[in-house]
């Protein structure tokens, strides 16, 4: 069933008659050129047809120009993320023009009304860009629109309406309600700029999705599957905020897109990489860690321009805070036999030992089930750079940690009271690093001992052939 927002009103109602009263002089959309990192500094206000502020505030016609576009607001004031983003852009691109599009009067409304205002705000931005294009040396190709939530669709409208094509639009968790399934010209879309990259951090397949679920760019990146963001659980939020509520969880997950983008600006030496995949489940299985044929990319500011014929959905895991980078590994475990498995799936953990560091004990998430006489693929990730892997410890958890598994074990015992020991045979583990694209095979330390059972562990060491490269390109990206 549809989300609980009806139509926005008929086309003929949308003549965009100004709502301002006679006494009101402040325009509904203002363009604030930020001339300092200091949020208290007023900056300069630009307006179409007035060239003096461009000169007074040293607007650099040949440099990159960023337009930051906020979304719907409940407070009617700028939120902290905006100041952080301005500061990060100034730090990274010292000569750039950073313009904050202030449409607070039109955004501080009922959500449905704010949605109805996105078109007129986009049109205002397009008019500003059309005017700037009349100036010598100004190029639309140097324009990068960065829109958060509802602001991402405003950026889409701006790109749609402008005479020509803007260089880039970044959509930071574009709003979902009233845009999910909308016409291509009624939302952010790949047609709106030469390169449209999108970060989705609050999508939900059940209930109301604050962020849009469908891909709307050339590349659409879904960190942590695009839904539950680490560090944003109710417990995390209650721990860090005096009045932690579900609203704070929503804000944390929705706003995470902005912080991932800021991270890509300020921690350019620690870029996060995303990998193309058809869906989140396949990514969780570790199937999608390839960099061939543009299948991986840096996320955020450092993303390489990709204009595929079809949209590219990309996934990655992240840490709970800055720097967000993690190191992804695909683990292929060939199970060549098992005994008396019963109903329950085994719970496996791995510990990776490397030249730089050792990982924590990492769970192997079984997305479907363990197949025998087949290669089972898993995704694991570490927060630290382990360097070259040396050995792996595989542990089969003994006592059940969930009541459900305990109950299944008990039922299993009732039906087969003399159930002999459960056992599984594994000869080798193949590992591929997402970040380096290197592949390595690990063999059991003792070739005679390949069996593992609950409460036991099995050790694997690098097989003789060492690291193998298979014509795979590393995702290492040239920074702009």
């Amino acid at each position: 069933s549809p989300v609980p927002f009806g139509p926005e009103g008929r086309l003929e109602d949308k003549l965009h008659k100004p709502k301002a009263t006679q006494t009101e002089v402040k325009p509904s959309v203002r363009f604030n050129l930020r001339t300092s990192k200091d949020p208290e500094h007023e900056g300069c206000y630009l307006s179409v047809g007035h060239s003096q502020p461009l000169e007074d505030c040293s607007f650099n016609m040949t440099a990159k120009t960023f337009f930051i576009i906020h979304g719907w607001t409940m407070s009617g004031i700028f939120e902290n993320w905006l100041h952080k983003l301005v500061s990060a852009l100034h730090t990274r691109e010292k000569d750039a023009n950073v313009v904050v599009v202030d449409w607070l009067p039109l955004a501080h409304q009922l959500y449905t009304d704010a949605v109805n205002n996105t078109r007129v705000v986009g049109h205002s931005i397009a008019r500003m860009l059309d005017w700037l294009q009349e100036k010598d040396d100004f190029s639309l190709g140097n324009v990068h629109l960065i829109g958060y939530s509802l602001g991402a669709h405003v950026a889409g409208y701006a790109g749609n309406f402008v005479k020509g094509t803007v260089g880039r639009i970044t959509g930071l968790d574009p709003a979902g309600p009233m845009f999910e399934g909308a016409d291509i010209h009624k939302r952010l879309s790949p047609d709106d700029a030469d390169f449209v990259d999108v970060l989705h951090t609050y999508t939900r397949s059940f209930g109301l999705s604050i962020g849009i679920q469908m891909p709307v760019g050339h590349i659409d990146i879904y960190p942590n599957g695009g839904d539950f963001q680490p560090g944003c659980g109710l417990n995390d939020v209650l721990g860090s905020i005096a009045y932690g509520t579900i609203t704070e969880v929503v804000k944390c997950e929705h706003e995470r897109a902005v912080h991932l983008f800021v991270d890509s600006l300020v921690n350019q030496d620690k870029p996060s990489f995303a990998f193309q995949c058809t869906d989140s489940n396949r990514f969780k299985k570790g199937i999608c860690l390839s960099c061939r044929k543009n299948r991986c990319n840096s996320i955020g500011y450092n993303a390489k321009k990709m204009r595929n014929k079809r949209n590219s959905k990309m996934y990655l895991k992240t840490r709970a805070g800055m720097p967000f980078r993690v190191y992804h590994y695909q683990m292929k475990i060939h199970v060549f036999s098992y005994k008396n498995m019963g109903e329950i799936e085994p719970t496996f953990y791995v510990t990776l030992y490397g030249t730089n560091a050792d990982s924590q004990t990492l769970p192997l998430e079984i997305v479907e089930r363990i197949e025998q006489n087949a290669t089972n693929t898993f995704l694991v990730y570490t927060e630290e750079d382990l360097g070259d892997l040396l050995k792996i410890q595989l542990t089969w958890e003994g006592a059940s940690q969930s009541w459900y598994n305990l109950w299944k074990e008990f039922r299993s015992y009732l039906s087969q009271p003399r159930n002999p020991g459960r056992e599984l045979n594994i000869r080798r583990i193949r590992v591929k690093s997402g970040e380096t694209q290197r592949k390595l095979t690990f063999c059991t330390e003792d070739p005679e001992n390949t069996s593992i059972s609950p409460g036991r562990e099995l050790w694997f060491r690098k097989c003789r052939d060492g690291w193998r490269m298979k014509n795979e390109t590393s995702p290492t990206v040239e920074l702009p």
Partner: antibody, heavy 116, light 107 residues
Framework: QVQLVQSGAEVKKPGASVKVSCKAS????????IAWVRQAPGQGLEWMGE????????KYNKKFKGRVTMTRDTSTSTVYMELSSLRSEDTAVYYC?????????WGQGTTVTVSS | DIQMTQSPSSLSASVGDRVTITCKAS??????VAWYQQKPGKSPKLLIY???YRFTGVPSRFSGSGSGTDFTLTISSLQPEDFATYYC?????????FGGGTKVEIK
């Protein structure tokens, strides 16, 4: 209310060109895309392309390989669709439609007959 | 280009019947699908947009559902004025593509 009024029926010879007009009223003309859709006798609907009047941006169906050109005149709130190198299979009713949620409102259609 | 395959191409039904028309996209179009009604000699009319939203003035007997590649238009209780041809269209990407149409005739 929103209205799209199209020009009258045309009869053309193969190889000739036809230019159909669509005059819009009742909404902000410059900020909504206007599409052209055709329907051959007894057949389904076929999207030909669309134009955004404000910036004159266009999107065309590759099938028409440079035979179609869409233009606009903002002073009269009119869009035009010109189809060149006409052939008998171009005989159809040509509709303009304004897009918002979908093709929300349609013109009455213009019949173009291509016959030697 | 995304192909939209509609079925059936025609159907016969009586007043009061529940009628279901399906549309299948050749690739994922999420919920970006619209449905139109066209009567002989008339222009098409928008019924449903974004897969499940009724357009202004459309009677509640018309409903749309589906996402991904499979979509359905349902007329819960067919009225005499509903005998027409129905088209689906994806509006996820350019070029926009229509289904072949379903003609609903009187039994």
């Amino acid at each position: 209310q929103v209205q799209l009024v199209q020009s009258g029926a045309e009869v053309k010879k193969p190889g000739a060109s036809v230019k159909v007009s669509c005059k819009a009223s009742g909404y902000t003309f410059t900020t909504y895309w206007i599409a052209w859709v055709r329907q051959a006798p007894g057949q389904g609907l076929e999207w030909m392309g669309e134009i955004l009047p404000g910036s004159a941006k266009t999107k065309y169906n590759k099938k028409f390989k440079g035979r179609v050109t869409m233009t606009r005149d903002t002073s009269t709130s009119t869009v035009y669709m010109e189809l060149s190198s006409l052939r008998s299979e171009d005989t159809a009713v040509y509709y303009c439609a304004v897009y918002d949620y979908g093709a929300d409102y349609w013109g009455q259609g213009t019949t173009v007959t291509v016959s030697s | 280009d995304i192909q939209m395959t509609q079925s059936p191409s025609s159907l016969s039904a009586s007043v009061g019947d529940r009628v279901t028309i399906t549309c299948k996209a050749s690739q994922d179009v999420y919920t970006a699908v619209a449905w139109y009604q066209q009567k002989p000699g008339k222009s098409p009319k928008l019924l449903i947009y974004s897969a499940s939203y009724r357009f202004t003035g459309v009677p509640s007997r018309f409903s749309g559902s589906g996402s991904g590649t499979d979509f359905t238009l349902t007329i819960s209780s067919l009225q005499p004025e509903d005998f027409a041809t129905y088209y689906c269209q994806q509006h996820y990407s350019i070029p926009r593509t229509f289904g072949g149409g379903t003609k609903v005739e009187i039994k």
